[in-house]
């Protein structure tokens, strides 16, 4: 079995303020079992954007239904983008752990740039 890879195919995405950003992410394997999380930024100060396992993320919707069997698409949409949302977004696979899930592998990141709303 090939080791899981996290694929973020878009190095950068440009979105107009007020629009919806789509951040694409797929994984290449069902193994290991565990959730996906999305972060803005890297390192200890990174900001959690979406956690498949738990939490409330009102601006975020998933592109695919993650409950469906064999789903490997963990792309998200972020609504009502503002300039404050600019940054690099990472799709991160976690491995089921006991008691806590453990970070397994990160995608390469997608840089989100925000274009000002035309006046």
């Amino acid at each position: 079995e090939e080791e899981l890879q996290v694929i973020q195919p878009d190095k950068s995405v440009l979105v107009a303020a007020g629009e919806t950003a789509t951040l694409r992410c797929t994984v290449t394997s069902l193994i290991p079992v565990g959730p996906i999380q999305w972060f803005r930024g890297a390192g200890p100060g990174r900001e959690l954007i979406y956690n498949q396992k738990e939490g409330h993320f009102p601006r975020v919707t998933t592109v695919s239904d993650s409950t469906k069997r064999n789903n490997m698409d963990f792309s998200i949409r972020i609504g009502n983008i503002t300039p404050a949302d600019a940054g690099t977004y990472y799709c991160v696979k976690f491995r089921k752990g006991s008691p806590d899930d453990v970070e397994f592998k990160s995608g390469a990141g997608t840089e989100l740039s925000v274009r000002a709303k035309p006046s």
């Epitope: 079995e1 069902l30 193994i31 079992v33 565990g34 498949q52 396992k53 738990e54 939490g55 239904d65 993650s66 409950t67 469906k68 069997r69 064999n70 789903n71 089921k96």
Partner: antibody, heavy 119, light 110 residues
Amino acid sequence: QVQLVQSGAEVKKPGASVKVSCKASGYTFTNYWINWVRQAPGQGLEWIAMIDPSDSETHYNQIFKDRATLTTDTSTSTAYMELRSLRSDDTAVYYCAMDYGSLYAMDYWGRGTLVTVSS
Amino acid sequence: DIVLTQSPDSLAVSLGERATINCRASKSVSSSGYNYIFWYQQKPGQPPKLLIYLASNLDSGVPDRFSGSGSGTDFTLTISSLQAEDVAVYYCQESRELPTFGQGTKLEIK
């Protein structure tokens, strides 16, 4: 961490119905399937059915499809399994279990609810 | 429906020895490169506990003396060096179609 807390033991007469509950915590209830499995005294495991709380999609074991109904209450993160027209051979421990990988497997289990059917 | 048949029904193994439990499916449980077989351990008075998923992958927190192998229709759960706490009933489960369980194998100490 993930917890599934089931309702207490029940004693029912033949022909009656029982509704067992399973309250989930430690994860987003709508993101993972819930399975129901039973085990008669001294016997093996028997899969009853499964439900996706996000859209109430269900799959039933043919043996139970006319007598069992699965439902969920997403406001309380609770799953229910109702079994009708009870017979003495329905006496069993009924388990709920959460599928963490959408693989139609059972990663986390409740402690079980003993249902006794006796006249 | 896929029928799973475990063998043996019961097994007695000395402490420190290898224990092997087999699970045969009535048709292939393989799909898209994965083998949809899972192994559970159940001790008296407790719910089952997932040990192995997709035939050969150790679940979180499971000691590495447990391993799973096989493909297609024939699968094996192996405990490389039996410990006293491994006394339990072991079940295989398939999910190539809707879930079904094997009948269980009772493992005891010789």
